[in-house]
């Protein structure tokens, strides 16, 4: 182990650290309205919030990145909040032959971490 | 496909967009000097730089995140530059029984993308 332990309590206050948030978006917002038929409104879970030192570190790289950011903030960026996993969704597509159901495995975040 | 195509040319100018950069760090920097013996100096490849619209998008989620950031910048963060892959490194550890070689699969970034 890297002898640096990620932590799960947010030192910045409730809702400030890296977490999953639902964002509503229309097909028009995404620029998909000409080829996706339904649903027209999507619930998109996204990762938002800050990544203070050791918070929800994705792996060893993220732990040392956090440490080096503390030492060289201009050179090394802080870890940032990105998806750790995704949940599949299905969208109805217009195709040359009609309409099909298409699965997206990487559209909606299911969990977040600091990488 | 998401009908939004990630791009590989940086619109911000050379070296400004998400890329791999080598950062030198000592075991003291990492706080590892009491239990890692060698090497004392590490070449750590890290992901740095900005993620402008559609640049090196990791997946569909990153593509739509970039789009929604353009529409709701206060609500949806821009994608950020994180490792897409890692290269393993071996460190020499001090253990109770002497010295051992330990492989770290997730310490040094090998590639970067915008997630």
């Amino acid at each position: 182990s890297a002898h640096l332990h990620p932590r799960d309590s947010c030192p910045l206050g409730p809702g400030r650290c890296c977490h999953l948030e639902t964002v509503q978006a229309t097909l028009e917002d995404l620029g998909w309205s000409d080829w996706v038929l339904s649903p027209r409104q999507l619930q998109l879970s996204m990762c938002v919030g800050e990544c203070p030192h050791l918070y929800r570190s994705a792996n060893t790289h993220a732990l040392i990145k956090a440490r080096l950011h503390g030492l060289q903030p201009d050179r090394v960026p802080a870890p940032c909040c990105v998806p750790s996993s995704y949940t599949p969704v299905v969208l109805m597509h217009r195709t040359d032959s009609g309409v099909s159901l298409q699965t997206y495995d990487d559209l909606v975040a299911q969990g977040c971490h600091c990488a | 496909s998401a009908h939004l195509h990630p791009r590989d040319s940086c619109p911000l100018g050379p070296g400004r967009c998400c890329h791999l950069e080598t950062v030198q760090a000592t075991l003291e920097d990492l706080g590892w000097s009491d239990w890692v013996l060698s090497p004392r100096q590490l070449q750590l490849s890290m992901c740095v730089g900005e993620c402008p619209h559609l640049y090196r998008s990791a997946n569909t989620h990153a593509l739509i995140k970039a789009r929604l950031h353009g529409l709701q910048p206060d609500r949806v963060p821009a994608p950020c530059c994180v490792p897409s892959s890692y290269t393993p490194v071996v460190l020499m550890h001090r253990t109770d029984s002497g010295v051992s070689l330990q492989t770290y699969d997730d310490l040094v970034a090998q590639g970067c993308h915008c997630a």
Partner: antibody
Framework: QVQLVQSGAEVKKPGASVKVSCKAS????????INWVRQAPGQGLEWMGW????????VYAQKLQGRVTMTTDTSTSTAYMELRSLRSDDTAVYYC????????????WGQGTMVTVSS | DIQMTQSPSSVSASVGDRVTITCRAS??????LAWYQQKPGKAPKLLIY???SLQSGVPSRFSGSGSGTDFTLTISSLQPEDFATYYC?????????FGGGTKVEIK
């Protein structure tokens, strides 16, 4: 709350047509598709087809192709299913149902409309 | 078309029993399987979607599992109001198809 309210029971002669309506409320009608599903007496559920209220794109079950037409009227948030050249084996309860949503859920169903085909 | 095969077609059980119903797809459908409960003279009611997600308002004694081709609906402790017919349904591809149904009867 989200509701789908269907038109009343119908009795038809073989060879005739029937048009069943399904009025939606409690959500934005054009955001989701509408399925039509039927159930013959004592039998299981049979999917008939799907329409997107927004654009009118449809998908029909192969066995009903040419006999069924699904339409929507966005001004009244109503979906319609017309079945032509009725036969006795079309006797069934006809349901409209909202979906599939982004998790493939067909979550809200109408109360059903009994269509009896008899000479 | 994807065929959905449900078993058993009927099951006799008592209040408090654990009941398991299985559904097999003729080809892989990822996790795009839903379970419905239907009582006589009523419309089907969605219980589980995406194989294992519990629909809002449905009691937690209902659970779903599986992916690919084999799926299960479990009622952990059967209640009097659970005696009904249960259907599985795939929405991985058109045409959407249903299983033949499983009738849960009082023993």
């Amino acid at each position: 709350q989200v509701q789908l309210v269907q038109s009343g029971a119908e009795v038809k002669k073989p060879g005739a047509s029937v048009k069943v309506s399904c009025k939606a409320s409690g959500y934005t009608f054009t955001d989701e598709g509408i399925n039509w599903v039927r159930q013959a007496p004592g039998q299981g559920l049979e999917w008939m087809g799907w329409i997107t209220a927004y654009s009118g794109d449809t998908v029909y079950a192969q066995k009903l192709q040419g006999r069924v037409t699904m339409t929507t009227d966005t001004s009244t948030s109503t979906a319609y299913m017309e079945l032509r050249s009725l036969r006795s084996d079309d006797t069934a309860v006809y349901y409209c149902a909202r979906g599939p949503g982004q998790y493939a859920d067909v979550d809200v169903w109408g109360q059903g409309t009994m269509v009896t085909v008899s000479s | 078309d994807i065929q959905m095969t449900q078993s058993p077609s009927s099951v006799s059980a008592s209040v408090g029993d654990r009941v398991t119903i299985t559904c097999r797809a003729s080809q892989g459908i990822s996790s795009w399987l839903a379970w419905y409960q239907q009582k006589p003279g009523k419309a089907p009611k969605l219980l589980i979607y995406a194989a294992s997600s519990l629909q809002s308002g449905v009691p937690s004694r209902f659970s779903g599992s599986g992916s690919g081709t084999d799926f299960t609906l479990t009622i952990s402790s059967l209640q009097p109001e659970d005696f009904a017919t249960y259907y599985c349904q795939q929405a991985n591809s058109f045409p959407i198809t249903f299983g033949g149904g499983t009738k849960v009867e009082i023993k």
